[in-house]
């Protein structure tokens, strides 16, 4: 039987890779219940001082960051990738994730989103990394695979509760986040609402119920009156910059 542990996340693009090797191992808590966390060799860690956050893909970074090699050129070819600050409008880009929230990459330049920049019926190719996290599965089914997913993006924006593929599918003030085993449009977090701050690779856990990121002008920070609490129970909320 499966135990229950509660966790929420504001990492909203795609579910980040869960902890390596946690599935089915002795001593690892695999939980499948509302708001799930399972733990492998990595413990949750909270750092208040900024450190470069290693990543394998954009989804592992915050909403105002993207994953790339710190040096110019091909991202991550033979080198470590880290989360880098997003690029503001009119800056050069190679993909949407490089541009800051409210912008998208068009012709190599970050442009402001107008909520209808995908013409009706335009096909967007997105690569989803399937990391084969097959808990209790037969051996040999756990190798990484890449799947090319083709989908149509329409003008109509999803309302709260609508299923989505990415945040651009959702109406203003909503993001695309995991809910149970699916993805739906959820509200972007307001000031004072609880958020989850991921600062290190391996600290994501398996998040069945993700929260959105904090809204514009807000950052996910430790709540002041929780500074004395133990590392594992520090509460993060959306606060003014």
């Amino acid at each position: 039987t499966l135990n229950s542990v509660l966790i929420n996340s504001n990492a909203i693009k795609n579910l980040p890779p869960p902890l390596g090797g946690a599935g089915g191992q002795p001593g690892s808590a695999v939980s499948v219940a509302p708001g799930v966390l399972y733990e492998g060799g990595n413990k949750y860690q909270t750092l208040d001082n900024y450190q470069p956050y290693p990543c394998a893909e954009d989804e592992e970074c915050g909403s105002d960051e993207y994953c790339s090699s710190p040096s110019r050129g091909a991202a991550g070819v033979g080198g470590v990738q880290i989360c880098l600050a997003c690029r503001k409008r009119r800056k050069r880009c190679m993909r949407h994730a490089m541009c800051c929230p409210g912008n998208y990459c068009k012709n190599g330049i970050c442009m402001p989103s107008d909520h209808s920049h995908f013409p009706r019926g335009e096909i967007e190719e997105s690569i989803i990394e399937n990391l084969g996290n097959d808990h209790n599965a037969a051996a040999g089914d756990g190798y990484p695979r890449r799947t090319t997913l083709t989908s149509k993006i329409y003008h109509t924006k999803g309302q709260e509760g609508s299923v989505c593929l990415r945040s651009s599918d959702c109406a203003a003030g909503l993001c695309c986040a995991r809910h149970f085993w699916s993805k739906i449009c959820k509200p972007v977090l307001k000031e004072g609402q609880v958020c989850t701050k991921h600062k290190r690779k391996g600290s994501h856990g398996l998040e069945i119920f993700q929260r959105c990121y904090c809204g514009e002008g807000l950052a996910c920070r430790i709540q002041k009156d929780h500074h004395q609490a133990s590392n594992s129970s520090r509460l993060h909320t959306c606060q003014r910059h």
């Epitope: 219940a33 509302p34 599965a137 299923v163």
Partner: antibody
């Protein structure tokens, strides 16, 4: 309109394998988690397995753990259930079911698996 | 696992009369999103289960208004205000707040 069509069932001997498929249409398959549920003859409903929208997370009922593998191909809008080391007690009608079961008929018509020597 | 307990397990009803089925869960089905993940299905002979009620009280499209669901937390009820011949079959409650999804044992409804 939302449709889930299961196939691949049949009569098989104990210890052998079978692969079920569920073809989905009428909804954004790649946004939804998918489940397999089964029903033994004259019995109630039992959950078998789930796979997340992107295939990264999978969970199984204790009774099928290590024998069954759930997978999906989002480019083909298809869900699979690979069933190995089949036992007599796996005899059932197998249904694929969509996660978030509030917005459309979330189950297929079912495919029958009979494990018998 | 969450245990779902239905009662009664069988019900014989005169057409036009009301019927009521109870479902109890071993833990609360109320989620932090405010929704309660409790469903009612009807399985007619030789057919797959069909959704009647989702999230306790919402009727699925095309379901007659004689069907209604109520309850909260761990106690739920399906009511049929006036049973008709076509309502025969086995009624199941189901929870989806966590996997494994679990079902009640089923309530067989027949016409007197």
């Amino acid at each position: 309109q939302v449709q889930l069509v299961e196939s691949g069932g049949g009569v098989v001997q104990p210890g052998r394998s079978l692969r079920l498929s569920c073809a989905a249409s009428g909804f954004t398959f790649s946004s939804y988690g998918m489940h397999w549920v089964r029903q033994a003859p004259g019995k109630g409903l039992g959950w078998v397995a789930v796979i997340s929208y992107d295939g990264s997370d999978k969970y199984y009922a204790d009774s099928v753990k290590g024998r069954f593998t759930i997978s999906r191909d989002n480019s083909k809008n298809t869900l699979y259930l690979q069933m190995n080391s089949l036992r007599a007690e796996d005899t059932a009608v197998y249904y694929c079911a969509r996660d978030l079961v509030d917005t459309a008929m979330p189950w297929g018509q079912g495919t029958t698996v009979t494990v018998s020597s | 696992d969450i245990v779902m307990t239905q009662s009664p397990l069988s019900l014989s009803v005169t057409p036009g009369q009301p019927a009521s089925i109870s479902c109890k869960s071993s833990q609360s089905l109320l989620h932090s999103d405010g929704k309660t993940y409790l469903y009612w299905y009807l399985q007619k002979p030789g057919q797959p289960p069909q959704l009647l009620i989702y999230e306790v009280s919402n009727r699925f499209s095309g379901v007659p208004d004689r069907f209604s669901g109520s309850g909260s937390g761990t106690d739920f009820t399906l009511k049929i205000s006036r049973v008709e011949a076509e309502d025969v079959g086995v009624y199941y409650c189901m929870q989806s707040i966590q996997v494994p999804w679990t079902f009640g044992q089923g309530t067989k409804v027949e016409i007197k």
